[in-house]
C-alpha cells in the first residue's frame, strides 16, 4: 500500500532500518553514530549551498523477539515486517537505508511498490543485481566475478604469462554474509564466472581442500576461498603445499593488510589476497574509533548512504524538482558523489565501484606487497609490481593445469 512520505516542505527524513539480522555483527549504536555523523556533514553541505532545509533520520528497530538470530540466512521476512511497521506508523522517509542481508533486500524489493530509493550496505548476492531503485555501497558479487574472469584471462603480464580456465572453489557453508554470496556467485552454474571457465569444482569439506594441496591428479592449481588469514590457517595449517598451487584469498573488507607493522605469516606464501584499496582518513575518524578493521567498511557504507542522499537531495532541490517522484527513486546511479573518504562512484545499476588490490607475500621481506590493482568501473587490471619476489618458480604465476604445454602461453615478440 502507498505510504505517505515525510519528504517535503523543507523537511526531509531518512528511514534507517536497524535490523537484528545484519551482514556484519556490528553494534547498532555504531551504525547510529555513522548515520549521525553523515547527517552533520549533509546539513553542512546543504547550508553551504544556500539550501535552508531540515534533514533527519528515523531509526526503525525490528522486533528482536521474532528476529533475533542475528544471521542473514534467517532474514527473509524481517525487512517486510519492518516495512509493515513503517506502513502502520505512516512514517516513511524520502529514502530507505538498509537492509544489508541479500535475502531480506530481495524479498522487500519483490513485495513492495518501490517508489522510493533503497540504499544498502550489503545485499551482495546476484539476485540483487540490476534492481532499478536499489543502490549498493559495498562491492557486490558481480564485481568480484568480473575481476576473477579478467585476471584468469590475463596472459600478457611479466608475472602471469598463462591464461587460466580452471579453478577449485572452497565453500563449506560457515562463511560470513559477504563470503557466502561471493562464493555462491562463483558456484552458480549460470553465472559469468562459470560460463567463462572450462573446469570448476566446489570443495565443501576441509579434507577435500587439504587433499588437493598435494594431489598429483588435481584438475587445477588454483583454489579460490573467502575469509581472512586465520580462516585459511585453520584449514591449511602448516601442511605442505605443491609448488604450483595458487590460493586466491578473497578478503575485501579487511584493512589489516595495510597496517604498517604487519608481517605475513609463512602459510601465506602461496596465497594472493584480494582486498579493497584502503581509505585515507578512516583511521582517525570519530565514528570509526571503536571499529575493527573489518567493520569499518560496513559503518562507512551507512555513512556514505547518508551522504549520497544529501548529494541527490541537493541536486533535486537546486533544480526545483520534486523528491517524492519515480525520477528521484531512479536517480541513485551512474554518478560520482563526495563520500566521507573521497569520491564514490556508482555504476549504471547503482552499485559501488572500487579499486581492488591483489597482494602477494614477498619471499625476501615477508611483507605484503601490491601485485596489481583492478578498477571495477572500467573492468581493467593495472600491474604494479613488474618483478615480484614470488614463492613460485621464476617469480611467475604457474599454469593453472600442471604439465599443460605452452599452447596457452603468451609469446612476447
Amino acid at each position: 500500500s502507498q505510504v505517505s512520505q515525510n519528504c517535503h516542505n523543507g523537511s526531509y527524513e531518512i528511514s534507517v532500518l536497524m535490523m537484528g539480522n545484519s551482514a556484519f555483527a556490528e553494534p547498532l549504536k555504531n551504525l547510529e553514530d555513522a548515520v549521525n555523523e553523515g547527517l552533520e556533514i549533509v546539513r553542512g553541505r546543504l547550508q553551504n549551498a544556500g539550501l535552508n532545509v531540515t534533514v533527519n533520520a528515523t531509526f526503525m528497530y525490528s522486533d528482536g523477539l521474532i528476529h533475533n538470530s542475528g544471521d542473514c540466512r534467517s532474514s527473509t521476512c524481517e525487512g517486510l515486517d519492518l516495512l509493515r511497521k513503517i506502513s502502520n506508523a505512516q512514517r516513511m522517509g524520502c529514502v530507505l537505508i538498509g537492509p544489508s542481508c541479500t535475502y531480506s533486500t530481495f524479498q522487500m524489493y519483490l513485495d513492495t511498490e518501490l517508489s522510493y530509493p533503497m540504499i544498502s550496505a550489503g545485499s551482495f548476492g546476484l539476485s540483487c543485481d540490476y534492481k532499478e531503485t536499489l543502490t549498493r555501497l559495498m562491492s557486490p558479487a558481480r564485481k568480484l566475478m568480473y575481476f576473477l574472469v579478467n585476471f584468469w584471462k590475463t596472459n600478457d603480464l611479466p608475472f602471469k604469462t598463462y591464461s587460466w580456465s580452471t579453478s577449485y572453489v572452497y565453500k563449506n557453508g560457515t562463511e560470513t554474509e559477504d563470503c557466502f554470496w561471493y562464493l555462491n556467485a562463483l558456484e552458480a552454474s549460470v553465472s559469468y564466472f562459470s560460463h567463462e571457465l572450462g573446469f570448476k569444482v566446489v570443495l565443501r569439506q576441509d579434507k577435500e581442500f587439504q587433499d588437493i594441496l598435494m594431489d598429483h591428479n588435481r584438475k587445477s592449481n588454483v583454489i579460490i576461498m573467502c575469509g581472512g588469514p586465520e580462516f585459511l590457517y585453520k584449514l591449511k595449517g602448516d601442511r605442505a603445499v605443491a609448488e604450483d598451487i595458487v590460493i586466491i584469498l578473497v578478503d575485501l573488507f579487511n584493512d589489516q593488510y595495510f597496517e604498517d607493522n604487519v608481517t605475513a605469516p609463512d602459510y601465506m606464501k602461496n596465497v594472493l589476497v584480494l582486498t579493497l584499496s584502503p581509505g585515507n582518513s578512516l583511521l582517525n575518524s570519530s565514528f570509526s574509533r571503536n571499529l575493527s578493521p573489518t567493520k569499518r567498511d560496513f559503518a562507512l557504507a551507512y555513512l556514505n548512504g547518508i551522504l549520497l542522499f544529501g548529494h541527490m537531495l541537493k541536486i533535486f532541490l537546486e533544480n526545483g524538482e520534486n523528491i517524492t517522484t519515480p525520477k528521484f527513486a531512479h536517480a541513485f546511479r551512474n554518478l560520482t558523489f563526495e563520500g566521507y573518504d573521497g569520491p564514490v562512484t556508482l555504476d549504471d545499476w547503482g552499485d559501488v565501484d572500487s579499486t581492488m588490490v591483489l597482494l602477494y607475500t614477498s619471499v625476501d621481506t615477508k611483507k605484503y606487497k601490491v601485485l596489481l590493482t583492478y578498477d571495477t568501473h572500467v573492468n581493467k587490471t593495472y600491474p604494479v609490481d613488474m618483478s615480484p619476489t614470488f614463492t613460485w618458480k621464476n617469480s611467475k604465476l604457474p599454469n593453472d593445469i600442471t604439465g599443460r604445454g605452452p599452447q596457452h602461453h603468451h609469446h612476447h615478440h
Epitope: F258, D260, S277, K367, Y368, V370, L371, D385
Partner: nanobody, 123 residues
Framework: QLQLVESGGGLVQPGGSLRLSCVTS????????IGWFRQAPGKEREGVIC???????KYADSVKGRFTISRDNAKNTVYLRMDSLKPDDTAVYYC?????????????????WGQGTQVTVSS
C-alpha cells in the same frame, strides 16, 4: 649517492599516450615511496601520483583513470604510463623519492628529486 633520472617525455597529440621512466640508484625501491610531480609554465608544482613503498598507488583526481604507475625492482625503475593525454597535461614531469616511514601512505614531502622530463601535448 641517491639518484633519480627521468626519461620518456616528448611531444604527443591530444588523446595519445606516453610512458615515462624513472631510473633510481643508491637505494632499494622497497624502502622508498616514489612520487611523480609536474610543473606547468607559470604554475605551482603539483603531485600527480605516488607509489607507497608497499606498492599502493595513490592518484590525484585529475589523472585518475588515465595515468598508472608501476615499478620494476629488478631494473630499479618506476614507470608512469599516461593515456588519453590532454593539453592540460603539458608540463615538466619530475620523479621524487622519500624514505618510507609508512608502507601504505604517501609521505608529506620528498627528499630526493630528478631533473625532470618535458611532456608537451599539442596538435
Amino acid at each position: 649517492q641517491l639518484q633519480l633520472v627521468e626519461s620518456g617525455g616528448g611531444l604527443v597529440q591530444p588523446g595519445g599516450s606516453l610512458r615515462l621512466s624513472c631510473v633510481t640508484s643508491g637505494f632499494t625501491l622497497d624502502d622508498y615511496a616514489i612520487g611523480w610531480f609536474r610543473q606547468a609554465p607559470g604554475k605551482e608544482r603539483e603531485g600527480v601520483i605516488c607509489l607507497t613503498s608497499g606498492g599502493l598507488p595513490k592518484y590525484a583526481d585529475s589523472v585518475k583513470g588515465r595515468f598508472t604507475i608501476s615499478r620494476d625492482n629488478a631494473k630499479n625503475t618506476v614507470y608512469l604510463r599516461m593515456d588519453s593525454l590532454k593539453p592540460d597535461d603539458t608540463a615538466v614531469y619530475y620523479c621524487a623519492a622519500s624514505g618510507a616511514t609508512s608502507r601504505w601512505n604517501c609521505p608529506p614531502q620528498y627528499d630526493h628529486w630528478g631533473q625532470g622530463t618535458q611532456v608537451t601535448v599539442s596538435s
